[in-house]
Interface confidence: medium
């Protein structure tokens, strides 16, 4: 589906970009934090049945995978790439795929990815060499 609208409008949620086209807000999986069975896999599905129309047109899809000695969780949200999330910059916010990058956090294993395609945080990838393969 084309990400830009061929008309400019004066609405906060159909914002004009520099070229005069209008960007619709993104569609992202948005289940906040949920327990996950995703572990030691090259890729995983979010198993989130909720899709959000993001609040603002520049927001992107984000997924955060965390593992500690108690559990594994997967967080799916919309977020503004200009702002940090959990204290980290959103890398690859323009990427069509959600490729996880490890972040240093005390007491847990922490991976985060961002992407800018419809529901792209539904399929999270831990190994870039497997980006064209099916989820395990």
């Amino acid at each position: 589906i084309p990400p830009h609208v061929p008309k400019s409008v004066n609405s906060d949620v159909m914002a004009s970009d520099n070229g005069g086209a209008v960007k619709l807000p993104q569609l992202c999986k948005f289940c906040d934090v949920r327990l996950s069975t995703c572990d030691n896999q090259k890729s995983c599905m979010s198993n989130c049945s909720i899709t959000a129309i993001c609040e603002k047109p520049h927001e992107v899809c984000v997924a955060v995978w965390r593992k500690n000695d108690k559990n594994i969780t997967l967080e799916t949200v919309c977020h503004d790439p200009k702002l940090t999330y959990h204290g980290f910059t959103l890398e690859d916010a323009a990427s069509p795929k959600c490729v996880m990058k490890e972040k240093k956090r005390a007491g847990e294993t922490f991976f985060m990815c961002a992407c800018n395609m419809e529901e792209c945080n539904d399929y999270i990838i831990f190994s870039e060499e497997y980006t064209t393969s099916s989820p395990d």
């Epitope: 004066n10 949620v13 159909m14 899709t51 959000a52 129309i53 603002k56």
Partner: nanobody
């Protein structure tokens, strides 16, 4: 509390027409861009159409351009989608939404969607 209630779906033959309505409450309707999205059986959500708060600007997915018309009546807090020349591939659950809407796919949610079935 935001509420969106879609209606107007049903069974229609290919080439036929339907008009969907969405009654909105719980927010300042005239200040919000509004959207129609759809979910075909076994598929993800797809943008259909969008309209600015004033109604002055509209967007249509390529797949519906020239066949569907989005409109709104801010005095009635109602969003519309006129669907003409319907095709089998238009069969889907249609949801109206505003930004921030969370659509729980496969389940009821506060805007429960309306099913459009195009079949002979």
């Amino acid at each position: 509390e935001v509420q969106l209630l879609e209606s107007g779906g049903g069974l229609v033959q290919p080439g036929g027409s339907l008009r969907l309505s969405c009654a909105a409450s719980g927010f300042t309707f005239g200040q919000e861009s509004m959207y129609w999205v759809r979910q075909a059986p076994g598929k993800g959500l797809e943008w259909v159409s969008a309209i600015s708060g004033s109604g002055g600007s509209t967007y249509y997915a390529d797949s519906v351009k020239g066949r569907f018309t989005i409109s709104r009546d801010n005095s009635k807090n109602t969003l519309y989608l006129q669907m003409n020349s319907l095709r089998a591939e238009d069969t889907a659950v249609y949801y109206c939404a505003k930004s921030g809407t969370r659509i729980k796919q496969g389940f009821d949610y506060w805007g429960q969607g309306t099913l459009v079935t195009v079949s002979s």
